[in-house]
């Protein structure tokens, strides 16, 4: 009778993570008597996967009844495959012996490759908010995929971005891989409702890429524009001055009125109105008793937005004996160049 050969018919097997791998092995003879063992890897550091004779291998099942003498099918199934199971598996026939069984013949090996899906991409933006016209960086990370080939794209509101850098690690062979990408995005005043999307395509996803998103509302800060306006007189000795705070984001805003540099009132934006672009408008008013003032009054609307240094707009009221008209201040920020006298 011809000497026993160990046949592993599959040079390679590709399995999706979580599924069961079948590793096929047959012997050409029932002689010699002795166990079959499966190993991952070769040489002295090889890892025992299954021993026909003894041991507990909860993830391994045999395809046929290996307890029987007439069995020549030594195929095994390994359940719940993970990327860590990737490697070359050898079916090895031993000859019965003492004190140990003697290795008799090995199969040629079957390379198990594991297809593992990438994790859902996680997109993270800068730690601090930035204002329009600034460039900010977003990172996208996805882990645990195999094989290494992967495609990553960035989008802003559906428009593909081109300014990004991507790395897949490790560079060499590994059971699974990670991808890390950094994209640069220029902010505009209209970006409150914008989204940045990281899209990952991989062979395991069957053409249905994974997406991670970041809302620019978490990143952008749109500073307000201020306008101080003098309203018609409510009573003979009272002037109503309004401060229009426009196009700001986020909502966190505190406004302080100063009369000749002295704090008159401080309030926090509450009942704001929202613009279509996601920014907010708010208006505060101050009733000034002109008769209480002998000299001209400098009114300042000072706004602290989202913890940033305060910006302000001033309006000068000229106090006179016979007030007859009123106007509006359209002066530039932090100045009171356009004066309106009250007669």
């Amino acid at each position: 009778e011809e000497e026993l050969q160990v046949i592993q018919p599959d040079k390679s097997v590709l399995v999706a993570a979580g599924e069961t791998a079948t590793l096929r092995c047959t012997a050409t003879s029932l002689i010699p008597v002795g166990p079959i063992q499966w190993f991952r890897g070769a040489g002295p550091g090889r890892e025992l996967i299954y021993n026909q004779k003894e041991g507990h291998f909860p993830r391994v099942t045999t395809v046929s009844d290996l307890t029987k003498r007439n069995n020549m099918d030594f195929s095994i199934r390994i359940g719940n495959i993970t990327p860590a199971d990737a490697g070359t598996y050898y079916c090895v026939k031993f000859r019965k012996g003492s004190p140990d069984d003697v290795e008799f013949k090995s199969g040629a090996g079957t390379e198990l490759s594991v297809r593992a899906k990438p994790s859902a991409p996680v997109v993270s933006g800068p730690a601090a908010r930035a204002t329009p016209q600034h460039t900010v960086s977003f990172t996208c990370e996805s882990h645990g995929f195999s094989p290494r080939d992967i495609t990553l794209k960035w989008f802003k509101n559906g428009n593909e971005l081109s300014d990004f850098q991507t790395n897949v690690d490790p560079v060499g062979e590994s059971v699974s891989y990670s991808i890390h990408s950094t994209a640069k995005v220029v902010l505009t005043r209209e970006d409150v409702h914008s989204q940045v999307i990281c899209e990952v395509a991989h062979v395991t996803l069957q053409g249905d890429p994974l997406r991670g998103t970041a809302n620019l509302s978490e990143t952008i800060r749109v500073p307000p524009t201020l306008e101080v306006t003098q309203q018609p007189v409510r009573a003979e000795n009272q002037v109503n001055v309004t401060c229009q705070v426009r196009k700001f984001y986020p909502q966190r805003l505190q406004l302080t009125w100063l009369e000749n540099g002295n704090v008159s009132r401080t309030e926090t934006a509450s009942t704001v109105t929202e613009n279509k672009d996601g920014t907010y408008n708010w208006m505060s008013w101050l009733l000034v008793n002109v008769s209480a003032h002998r000299d001209d009054v400098k009114l300042t609307c000072q706004v602290e937005h989202d913890g940033q240094p305060a910006v302000s707009k001033s309006h000068d009221l000229k106090v006179s004996a016979h007030p007859k008209e009123q106007g509006s201040n359209t002066a530039a920020e932090n100045t009171g160049s356009n004066e309106r006298n009250i007669y």
């Epitope: 009778e1 029932l30 003498r69 007439n70 003492s98 004190p99």
Partner: antibody, heavy 118, light 107 residues
Framework: EVQLVESGGGLVQPGGSLRLSCAAS????????MHWVRQATGKGLEWVSV???????YYPGSVKGRFTISRENAKNSLHLQMNSLRAGDTAVYYC????????????WGQGTMVTVSS | DIQMTQSPSSLSASVGDRVTITCRAS??????LAWFQQKPGKAPKSLIY???SLQSGVPSKFSGSGSGTDFTLTISSLQPEDFATYYC?????????FGQGTKLEIK
Amino acid sequence: EVQLVESGGGLVQPGGSLRLSCAASGFTFSSYDMHWVRQATGKGLEWVSVIGISGDTYYPGSVKGRFTISRENAKNSLHLQMNSLRAGDTAVYYCARGGNWDDALDIWGQGTMVTVSS
Amino acid sequence: DIQMTQSPSSLSASVGDRVTITCRASQDINNYLAWFQQKPGKAPKSLIYTTSSLQSGVPSKFSGSGSGTDFTLTISSLQPEDFATYYCQQYVSYPYTFGQGTKLEIK
């Protein structure tokens, strides 16, 4: 059902010969090593011989040169040719299948009695 | 040849008892050891092979352990049908050899 049935036992004079047979059924006979084991009355078990799948044979020193094991795979039968019999060969002879992967004996026949006496 | 020595040669026990029979080989036999049960006038019945593997159909009250040269057969809770003679056998190399047997009797 897996079954082994021995036959051919009986009374024989010292120096005489006897041929035992074992009929196998319920399994692929050619794929198993087959053994003979004997047991003298009131004594323990003694392994007598084996024939492997490929026809290779082994015997203990006590029967070597006198006993010959053979198999007819086409007829699913095992034989033990016993020559130069001695009184010490008196025993119940069992055929057994090396049915486990490691050739452990898993199935035994009911036995046939061989008596060597003048 | 490899000698197999069983102890004790005989053992008295009661129904429900847990009993252990030992078997010692004269040299290392790896774990190629089998246990058989034999009742008077009957053929031996295989219980355990490769030291601890239960033969198909054998109840789990029978268990085997050991390696190298020292082996044990344990019956966890004796029942009336378990009173019989038990043999160990090495089958690592020819000639296969048996222990002399342990007769388990009712106390």
